[in-house]
């Protein structure tokens, strides 16, 4: 199909950064300022993305590639290609409709984005809490109580080595 298309389409060989100009008998013309074409054979150039307001320019637009945006300090990217900027919160907080709110007891957030998540329930794994959780940090689970009972050893001694060709004593 691609070969058939290229033989039929007089525009198929216009390089990236140009467009096939119907107003000039289908010759290749450069993309105008503030536009780009990232692939060859284009009949139009796309308008460059503009990084305004809470967005800032991470990569300038060129004739062959779109501009790339990120977010100003205090905000972080959301969505494909940083389509949105969301306000940062402090660690130990989450963003709600009313702004940044502290994590409820029993939950934590160790990042400036995202939601508060419940502390790990150590007992589900038969373990005990070694370090208590905070708004900013999850609990640290320690060994299970059985592991700490007297006489219990966490290391199993290796079986005695047998020399080849000798029967056991």
């Amino acid at each position: 199909f691609e070969r058939t298309r290229s033989l039929q389409d007089p525009c198929s060989n216009c390089p990236a950064g140009t467009f096939c100009d119907n107003n000039r008998n289908q010759i290749c013309s450069p993309c105008p300022p503030n536009s780009f074409s990232s692939a060859g054979g284009q009949r139009t150039c796309d308008i460059c993305r503009q990084c305004k307001g809470v967005f800032r320019t991470r990569k300038e637009c060129s004739s062959t590639s779109n501009a790339e945006c990120d977010c100003t300090p205090g905000f972080h990217c959301l969505g494909a290609g940083c389509s949105m900027c969301e306000q940062d919160c402090k660690q130990g907080q989450e963003l709600t409709k009313k702004g940044c709110k502290d994590c409820c007891f029993g939950t934590f957030n160790d990042q400036k984005r995202g939601i508060c998540r419940p502390w790990t329930n150590c007992s589900l794994d038969g373990k005990s809490v070694l370090v208590n959780g905070t708004k900013e940090r999850d609990v640290v689970c320690g060994p299970s109580p059985a592991d700490l009972s007297p006489g219990a050893s966490s290391v199993t001694p290796p079986a005695p080595a047998r020399e080849p060709g000798h029967s056991p004593q």
């Epitope: 033989l7 060989n13 950064g17 289908q26 010759i27 290749c28």
Partner: nanobody
């Protein structure tokens, strides 16, 4: 406005050489394919050679090994170096700006006025 101006034609003996030039203006030369065509008296215009922006070239079978097409993007000029000329090469040679930077099955968007090449003993 697109302009294509051929030069370099003239009279030459069989086996001789000529270099045709085509000075282009009014468009982005470096991103477009250019071609040479010719029309002998009483015959249809025919394809001779073409060169795309990336310098890939295509030739008519009748001129392969004798003619060389080249381009100088800094000077917006395309050339046709013709050697081992024959009587049957006698024609008006036209420069063409090709549609869509295509040298395969080329189609001409704009023509020059032509320059006459005469090969005779």
């Amino acid at each position: 406005e697109v302009q294509l101006l051929e030069s370099g034609g003239g009279e030459v003996q069989p086996g001789g050489s000529l270099r045709l030039s085509c000075a282009a203006s009014g468009f982005s030369f470096s991103i477009n394919a250019m071609g040479w065509y010719r029309q002998a008296p009483g015959k249809r215009r025919e394809f001779v050679a073409a060169i795309e922006s990336g310098s890939n070239t295509v030739y008519a079978e009748s001129v392969k090994g004798r003619f060389t097409i080249s381009r100088d993007n800094a000077k917006n000029t395309v050339y046709l170096q013709m050697s081992s000329l024959r009587a049957e090469d006698t024609a008006v040679y036209y420069c063409g700006l090709l549609k869509g930077n295509r040298v395969v099955s080329p189609s001409v968007a704009y023509w020059g006025q032509g320059t006459l090449v005469t090969v005779k003993p």
